[in-house]
């Protein structure tokens, strides 16, 4: 799978994580920080 950093317009898309652009899938993906989940890493779990 080809990946690259998200475009600058996606700054802030991932609330608690790193934004990755999955080129072949034509979509952005949030790699969440430990303790966070959700499509945009918006949910905290203990």
């Amino acid at each position: 799978v080809s990946i690259t950093k998200c475009n600058s317009d996606m700054n802030g898309y991932c609330l608690h994580g790193q934004c990755i652009y999955l080129v072949d899938m034509s979509q952005n993906y949030c790699r969440c920080e430990v303790g966070y989940t959700g499509v945009r890493c918006e949910h905290f779990y203990l």
């Epitope: 690259t4 475009n7 317009d9 802030g12 499509v39 945009r40 918006e42």
Partner: antibody
């Protein structure tokens, strides 16, 4: 199946406002960003602005600042684009476009006609 | 705002010809360019994103290349069904469309 269903065609008088809706099904708009694009008859595509429904923040093309308002109601999974002070050159098909989780998935378009 | 200058605005070519359209950005867009095909009365159809990544179901005669500020879209062998208007879109910083290229059969 993911869908963006837009409201029906509108006819407005110059100076009036129009509000176009864009209802999402099959996905949560909070996971995406919703862009708005328009196309006047026989003309090219023009990006107007976008909203991040989760955060509520918006970005607009400079030429539309002060005249366009993009909102989202996450409880109904619907985005809206309101354009005020309409003039004849605002006659166009208006599209909502999903971006973020999937690259550029388009609604069917809404024709807005401005005529006296 | 980033400006996108697309050329030519129209072209006429024969079936089987190689067709090339260019888009020049006013600043580096880091390969974040997409190409759309639009036929009359239809919504635009995404062909290519991230400079050269073909969307599923799009024929391999369509291709894209470029980097920095200069990008190219190519139809290697024009077919009658390719008659349409083509647009580039930069999506690095907000969004800007090129002015479009109307492709006709000679």
């Amino acid at each position: 199946q993911d869908q963006l269903v837009q409201s029906g065609a509108e006819v407005k008088k110059p100076g009036a406002s129009v509000k176009v809706s864009c209802k999402a099904s099959g996905f949560n708009i909070k996971d995406t960003r919703i862009q708005w694009v328009r196309q006047a008859p026989g003309q090219g595509l023009e990006w107007m602005g976008r909203i991040d429904p989760l955060r509520g923040n918006t970005k607009y093309r400079e030429k539309f600042e002060g005249r366009v308002t993009i909102t989202a109601d996450t409880s109904t999974n619907t985005a809206y684009m309101e354009l005020s002070s309409l003039r004849s050159e605002d006659t166009a098909v208006y599209y909502c476009v999903r971006s973020g989780t999937l690259f550029d998935f388009w609604g069917q378009g809404t024709l807005v006609t401005v005529s006296s | 705002d980033i400006q996108m200058t697309q050329s030519p605005s129209s072209l006429s070519a024969s079936v089987g010809d190689r067709v090339t359209i260019t888009c020049k950005a006013s600043q580096d867009i880091h390969k974040y360019i997409a190409w759309y095909q639009q036929k009359p009365g239809q919504a635009p159809r995404l062909l290519i994103q991230y400079t050269s990544t073909l969307q599923p179901g799009v024929p391999s005669r369509f291709s894209g290349s470029g980097s920095g500020t200069d990008y190219t879209f190519t139809i290697s062998s024009l077919q009658p069904e390719d008659i349409a208007t083509y647009y580039c879109l930069q999506y690095d910083n907000l969004r800007t469309f090129g002015g479009g290229t109307k492709v006709e059969i000679k």
